[in-house]
């Protein structure tokens, strides 16, 4: 983008392609099928002057590329930035033996400011550039590249000024952008470690050793220092201070944690909050230990909530249709704090004359969509013996199950496998409405197939669409259903259960409760 | 000045065969593929296919294989286009096209003036 | 095979308008698309690759770009040598022409 660019402090640009207005005019050799310069577009649709070369055919290429005088600024070592792209050789057909992959960085100190030809003897090789990643075709979107940064320093340097030069052996290449810069080492203090202004080294070789000193509450594995490197950074310290476990950095110092507050290591982090159901109770807490019947799960942050076991799911309901059963449930009441709730099935065969006596049911037992690890409140099982009584066992997990298990995070069903359930029941009334409760009755199933051992309804809101629904078991034709709210639509359905499992549920009847007492009766149908 | 000089119009009869030649200068004629291009009468552009000049290695479009045959004369900086068993339906200008390779796309940049191969009984 | 659809078929325009040419592509070709100009009796001439770079010395009043399946070549002024056809070109494993777009004069 041309314009200036902002860079770090402690960088003094002596030369930016990018900050160009126009042609950047270097000098080519070859002058012509060599590097050529061409302007595309970046993001923003500014042009970019770049030079490319793309002479892969051939073997034995030598086509350089030198850039304009760049003036020293008394800096006697130089950082050299390019960012370029570089097609990969895959990508061009026919021309494994001749293309490559890198291509050379050259200098030449110089007190002329205008030296109009390029003399490869006069040129001192920096290095050899090679791309981090090159791309194939596919990878250039709509002016979207894949940019390699590679950074270079050369020096001492004594002259007045240097060029710059590229060597191009047979790559397909494109210089987008070549920044040369010089570096001051700044003052710093860093990590609670104080380090004073430090003025850089004469040469490579003269490092300045600088001394930090720790803050109160802070701990150093070895005496924090910095060397000061000619190249006006600050060479990775040797040691270092970091706030102490329970502590964290308040205006330069380490501070103990508050109550209800911990920090689990020397870290540069601040003190956090006790997770939900967990706590702290001194000051200075490294860790936070979570309440009774809460707990962590293995891959579970120390930031994160203690959580607990879901409890039972609700509501189960089982299809049984000769010898497959469906069964359906509700979510739990409380899914113990977490988002991992899944479901295992556990099928258990047992015995006819001692239910007592189960066994697992094999695996020649089908699930869909699967026996364990459901995220679904369903479940088909199929293949099952015929004439044999099966007591299926729902388990509502979580990622802390294992550390708690109990049977109260289970619920069960016993049916029967190969009998036929009961029809449905044709027809249900509402014998008495009030303001909070129906008394509903009905006719045993045209076809009870067996001895009927009770009626389950199941009952809802009409504008919840079945969404939380409950159930009501009786073993009579009747029963009331109480705690209703007044002025509301409910839907019942009823159905029958004998040894062989549950029928269909009858055709909805729609009851609206009301304000004053009165008997209604229904016919299967919707009554108000 | 880089060009390409392809030879002047040819008619031909059904079942006979025609070279054409396409003569580049201005450049090295090893450092650049050569593409061929057929166009019909009134038609559009067909690539036919290119060739490696530095080994000599074709490649054909779909549909151009069999009778077509692309060659080299690198003493000469020539490329050919053979066509054999010439059809009614071969009858169409053919261009051959220097192919460039960069790193932000590739392109014919520069072409010949074209050949009309007429076949007709 | 990659097949490339350019529309409109003819564009009218008259000389210093604007003109848009498209290039829609059957799958992604990236940015792997060439555009060229072919006069009568002349042979064609490469405006641009790579989607939207233009070779030295087309004029900058040729701009295009695009990249996947949808592409499109921009005339800022139509100058009168520019009534000609143009042609889309997609480069991958095999390579493959448009049908052209003739620009006329309105």
């Known amino acids: 983008v041309t314009g200036s660019r902002v860079y770090p402090a402690n960088e003094v640009t002596l030369l930016d392609s990018r900050s160009v207005q126009g042609e950047l005019g270097w000098i080519a050799s070859p002058l012509e099928g060599g590097w050529e310069e061409v302007s595309i577009m970046d993001e923003k649709n500014t042009p970019i002057r770049t030079y490319q070369v793309c002479n892969v055919m051939e073997a034995s290429q030598n086509n350089w590329l030198r850039t304009d005088w760049i003036t020293r600024e008394g800096a006697q070592r130089v950082y050299i930035e390019i960012k370029f792209t570089l097609r990969d050789c895959n990508s061009l057909p026919g021309v494994m033996g001749t293309c490559k992959e890198t291509f050379n960085l050259y200098y030449y100190e110089s007190d002329n400011d205008k030296e109009r030809f390029i003399r490869e003897s006069q040129f001192g090789k920096i290095d050899t550039i090679a791309a981090d990643e090159s791309f194939t075709q596919v990878d250039i979107g709509d002016r979207i590249m894949k940019l390699n940064t590679e950074i270079r320093d050369v020096g001492p340097l004594s002259k007045k000024g240097f060029y710059l030069a590229f060597q191009d052996v047979g790559a397909c290449i494109a210089l987008v952008s070549v920044r040369v810069f010089y570096k001051k080492c700044p003052l710093t203090v860093r990590n609670l470690a104080q380090f004073p202004d430090t003025i850089t080294g004469a040469d490579t070789s003269s490092l300045v050793e600088v001394r930090g000193s720790c803050v109160n509450n802070s701990e150093e594995k070895d005496v924090p220092k910095m060397y000061c490197g000619a190249d006006g950074e600050w060479l990775v310290p040797i040691g270092n201070c970091l706030c102490n476990a329970g502590h964290e950095e308040q205006n330069g110092e380490c501070q103990a944690c508050k109550i209800g507050y911990y920090k689990a290591l020397s870290t540069d982090a601040s003190c956090a909050k006790c997770p939900p159901h967990s706590y702290s109770v001194w000051e200075g807490a490294t860790s936070c230990t979570c309440d009774r019947g809460f707990f962590r799960a293995d891959n579970d942050a120390a930031s994160m909530p203690c959580t607990r076991p879901p409890s039972a799911p609700l509501n189960l309901i089982s299809n049984v249709n000769e010898t497959s059963v469906n069964l359906e449930w509700s979510s739990p009441q409380n899914t113990g704090g977490r988002q991992d709730i899944s479901y295992n099935v556990v099928c258990k065969k047992c015995g006819a004359g001692d239910p007592s006596k189960c066994r697992p049911c094999g695996s020649g037992v089908h699930y869909t969509p699967q026996q364990n690890g459901l995220k679904t409140t369903r479940v088909s099982i199929t293949d099952l013996l015929a004439h044999t009584n099966y007591t299926f066992e729902i388990w509502a997990v979580n990622g802390v199950s294992k550390y708690n298990p109990s049977p109260d995070q289970s619920v069960s069903v016993t049916v029967t496998t190969n009998q036929a359930a009961p029809s449905s029941i044709a027809l249900v009334q509402a014998k008495e409405v009030t303001r909070y409760s129906v008394a509903l009755a009905w006719l045993e199933p045209d076809r009870p197939n067996g001895v009927i051992l009770e009626y389950e309804v199941k009952y809802y809101e009409k504008d919840q669409n079945e969404r939380s629904y409950r159930i009501v078991r009786t073993a009579a034709r009747n029963t009331d259903i109480k705690g209703l709210n007044p002025l509301t639509s409910y839907v019942f359905h009823v159905r029958a259960r004998t040894a062989a499992g549950y029928g269909d549920f009858s055709e909805p009847l729609e009851v609206t409760t009301n304000t004053v007492p009165s008997r209604i009766i229904g016919d299967g149908a919707n009554s108000t | 000045q880089v060009q390409l000089l392809q030879s002047g119009a040819e008619v031909k009869k059904p079942g006979a065969s025609v070279k054409v030649p396409c003569k580049a200068s201005?450049?090295?004629?090893?450092?650049?593929?050569m593409s061929w291009v057929r166009q019909a009468p009134g038609q559009g552009l067909e690539w036919m296919g290119w060739?490696?000049?530095?080994?000599?290695?074709?490649t054909y479009a779909q549909g151009f294989t069999g009778r077509f045959v692309f060659s080299l004369d690198t003493s000469v900086s020539t490329a050919y286009l053979q066509i054999s068993s010439l059809k009614a339906e071969d009858t169409a200008v053919y261009y051959c096209?220097?192919?460039?390779?960069?790193?932000?796309?590739?392109?014919?940049?520069?072409w010949g003036q074209g050949t009309l191969v007429t076949v007709s009984s | 095979e990659i097949v490339l659809t350019q529309s409109p078929a003819t564009l009218s325009v008259s000389p210093g308008e604007r003109a848009t040419l498209s290039c829609r592509a059957s799958?992604?070709?990236?940015?792997?698309l060439a555009w060229y100009q072919q006069k009568p009796g002349q042979a064609p001439r490469l405006l641009i690759y790579g989607a939207s770079t233009r070779p030295t010395g087309i004029p900058d009043r040729f701009s295009a770009s695009g990249s996947g399946t949808d592409f499109t070549l921009t005339i800022s002024r139509v100058e009168p040598e520019d009534f000609a056809v143009y042609y889309c070109?997609?480069?991958?494993?095999?390579?493959?022409f448009g049908q052209g777009t003739k620009v006329e004069i309105k």
């Open positions: 070109q997609q480069y991958g494993p095999s390579w493959t």
């Open positions: 799958q992604s070709v990236s940015s792997n």
């Open positions: 096209a220097r192919v460039r390779f960069t790193v932000y796309g590739d392109g014919m940049d520069v």
């Open positions: 201005g450049y090295t004629f090893t450092s650049r593929a």
């Open positions: 060739i490696n000049t530095n080994t000599g290695n074709p």
